[in-house]
Amino acid sequence: EEELQVIQPEKSVSVAAGESATLNCTATSLIPVGPIQWFRGVGPGRELIYHQKEGHFPRVTPVSDPTKRNNMDFSIRISNITPADAGTYYCVKFRKGSPDVELKSGAGTELSVRAKPSAPVVSGPAVRATAEHTVSFTCESHGFSPRDITLKWFKNGNELSDFQTNVDPAGKSVSYSIRSTARVVLTRRDVHSQVICEVAHVTLQGDPLRGTANLSEAIRVPPFLEFTQQSMRADNQVNVTCQVMKFYPQRLQLTWLENGNVSRTEMASALPENKDGTYNWTSWLLVNVSAHRDDVKLTCQVEHDGQPAVNKSFSVKVSAHPKEQGSNTAAENTGTNERGSSDYKDDDDKHHHHHH
């Protein structure tokens, strides 16, 4: 009689997570009588997957009825495959005995599990940064197999090149994780911008997964301040406005000071949005010129998004001659910038403005 051979025809089998895996095995002879066992791995630490003779293996079913006469098909089907099931499976013939004696093993079938990556999660910086600064965005996706994966970054549809990607672990594993960090230079126009992390994997059938982050969460656009003054009114009052322009986010407090004394404090709320996502706000102050003997120094102090206050000052000249309705302005902008004007250059006042 021919010597028994245990044949595992497939060297490898690839299965999607959640599906069933069929591991084929046939014996070439009915002799000797004895059971088949399936193991994952080799050596003393091998894991018993199925024992024809004894035990309870709820996820494993023999493909061929083991009670079938002259059965030499010992293939098994493993249901609900997960990445943890990956490994090399061996069909091993035993000779009947007390105990049964291991006789011959098949060559093994490597089971690889195709598992989809999780939806990419993109996280931005913990604190906001201003234009021209570089911020980092991180993209993470987990639980995929095999290890090969492609990750791309986009900003408003344009592919980014400044990023670093790691796939872990480096060695063999049942599943893998990817982490990528992209560096993005902010501009003042980025309030409506979006970064997208795109992950492509064999399990996704060419339909990549995307994770997004809004730059609105990462950016701070500091305001420009401008003063304007209307003509003196008949009641000797001058209307002075402080225009706070092109700022983001909306969180902003404005304080008027007359000769260094707080006159009024206001909080920005429910402002209309500019096309670019920034906000404008105008605040005005009526100055009663007749109540002052000397020139009035007005300061518009803006505290934006918890940052150090930005000041813009303005002098209202008190004239000696009487005022007439509709006459020319009796005040002039001295152009004093105690805390950087629209170009935000630092000055020497007690407030120190830190760029981020």
């Epitope: 009915l30 009588v33 004895g34 004894e54 083991p66 009670t67 079938k68 006469r69 059965n71 009947k96």
Partner: antibody, heavy 119, light 110 residues
Framework: QVQLVQSGAEVKKPGASVKVSCKAS????????INWVRQAPGQGLEWIAM????????HYNQIFKDRATLTTDTSTSTAYMELRSLRSDDTAVYYC????????????WGRGTLVTVSS | DIVLTQSPDSLAVSLGERATINCRAS??????????IFWYQQKPGQPPKLLIY???NLDSGVPDRFSGSGSGTDFTLTISSLQAEDVAVYYC????????FGQGTKLEIK
Amino acid sequence: QVQLVQSGAEVKKPGASVKVSCKASGYTFTNYWINWVRQAPGQGLEWIAMIDPSDSETHYNQIFKDRATLTTDTSTSTAYMELRSLRSDDTAVYYCAMDYGSLYAMDYWGRGTLVTVSS
Amino acid sequence: DIVLTQSPDSLAVSLGERATINCRASKSVSSSGYNYIFWYQQKPGQPPKLLIYLASNLDSGVPDRFSGSGSGTDFTLTISSLQAEDVAVYYCQHSRELPTFGQGTKLEIK
């Protein structure tokens, strides 16, 4: 360790029925056929029938087809053989035996149950 | 049905001598290269014990003084050197179709 433990001896009157049990242990009950064989005093072995516990498929010796019924209870890994319309020549030791190689052979045997039919 | 006929019905052999028991089938019990013949040993008060399967293969734990041979319709069980513990009744069985047993051969010491 495969074990087949059979029920105790029975004494029956002619025309009665007997149900012999065979409790299996040490292996997966549903993966192997159970055979029933009898042996009259001083006589040879006579095959009665076989059952596949996984799906209750049965094969009977024509001689016993109308009088014997094989059943199994997979929850207790127990096989049963009922013989009806007993006659005195049914007096025998009744064995259950497990077919380990699915070759329709008898690899492991119970110790037997003596059924005596006497008026 | 396939009928199995054993010969002789009884046999007396001296200790250490060879014992041979024959089993003839009424038609071939061979299929797909296998001979579906099995040999059993039964000692008084005990259930039968499988010795040989598929005509020539020794079952687990069976001493190698036992051997089986034959094909088609004619088969032989041989005990190469009889031991006292081999005294028993020996049966052949086929499974080419539904199983049947031979009538048995009683082996004694001469």
